[in-house]
């Protein structure tokens, strides 16, 4: 293929719930991805795999199969949700996320996503990594790009 461009746009929404007994945080994070087909023919997106890391620990994974086909010189915006769990050795975060005295409980998460297209039996994978702020203290809907976390670890595109 000429090229298939994948751009991670950002977090669209984060829905939070807690287990008080287990001091566990459940975050359902919906992300937005733009996939652009620069070829002069349609391509099929076979799957999208995603994972979320907090403090270098994987806290959630998701996989979407048989997503879509994208026409030539066209772009599709795809939303995907990763269920995440912050628990056990990270249960100290429960206190921070449920602290009433602060308004915004932002934590930095690393979003990793891999898009797989198949071309006559040959798979092509394109990956992206982005650091994002997510509020673990309340349900939040974000403007696209609003949750981006910029630091030296995150190469700019």
């Amino acid at each position: 293929p000429r090229s298939i461009d994948v751009k991670y746009i950002g977090v669209k929404s984060a829905y939070v719930s807690y287990d008080v007994q287990k001091r566990t945080i459940y975050l359902n994070i919906t992300n937005t991805l733009n996939i652009t087909n620069n070829n002069y023919y349609s391509v099929e997106v076979e799957n999208i795999t995603a994972q979320v890391q907090f403090a270098k620990t994987v806290i959630g994974k998701a996989r979407l199969n048989n997503i879509t086909h994208i026409g030539p010189l066209d772009m599709k915006q795809i939303d995907y949700t990763v269920p995440t769990v912050i628990a056990e050795e990270m249960s100290y975060m429960y206190d921070f996320c449920t602290l009433i005295s602060i308004k915004v409980h932002n934590i930095v998460l690393m979003m990793q996503v891999t898009v797989t297209t198949t071309y006559f039996g040959h798979s092509e994978q394109i990956s992206q990594e982005r650091y994002q702020y997510v509020d673990c203290g309340r349900n939040t809907t974000y403007q696209l790009g609003q949750s981006e976390y910029l630091n030296v670890l995150q190469p700019q595109q």
Partner: antibody, heavy 122, light 107 residues
Framework: QVQLQQSGAELIRPGTSVKVSCKAS????????IEWVKQRPGQGLEWIGV????????NYNEKFKGKAKLTADKSSSTAYMQLSSLTSEDSAVYFC???????????????WGQGTSVTVSS | DIQMTQSPSSLSASLGERVSLTCRAS??????LNWLQQEPDGTIKRLIY???SLDSGVPKRFSGSRSGSDYSLTISSLESEDFVDYYC?????????FGGGTKLEIK
Amino acid sequence: QVQLQQSGAELIRPGTSVKVSCKASGYAFTDYLIEWVKQRPGQGLEWIGVINPGSGGTNYNEKFKGKAKLTADKSSSTAYMQLSSLTSEDSAVYFCVRSSYGVYVAYPMDYWGQGTSVTVSS
Amino acid sequence: DIQMTQSPSSLSASLGERVSLTCRASQDIGSNLNWLQQEPDGTIKRLIYATSSLDSGVPKRFSGSRSGSDYSLTISSLESEDFVDYYCLQYASSPRTFGGGTKLEIK
């Protein structure tokens, strides 16, 4: 039957611009690509660029970036090519061409318009 | 850009004769090649796509083939309407590029 009907011949002053139209009929306009090709008098063919009328997505030959702008109007099944800052080098016949495609396959340039002659002269 | 070198640039032949036109690709283009015919009034039509597939309505005397990086258009028995211009087109990569053309003239 498939037809690509192009606008008539143009005589244009240097430095101005021209918009050539290509009206498609006999098929679903947004299911195919439209490409544009240049042919200077007595010379060969040169690819300008391509547009997907469904998405509006375009790709250009580097040589024609800034010179040609491709657009399409789905409601009238018409593709357009605007040429700007015209010089004598732009005097040519311009063809619009339909291209078909599938998943991972392309069968380009199956139907051609009749061509539009653009003459740049003061 | 991929260069398509077409030969000969002109060819004189007689009615009923068998002729072959050739295009050589500067890079691998697989089977991504068309042959086009241009009439004196400027009308262009595709004769062959994907190296060897004949377009509907095109007479069977036209055929396409490939040997390595050389692509051929063969006309098995020339008829009067075949004495026009022919071009090859590669569509393996962008920008699409054309051969310089062959003018087929009656001897």
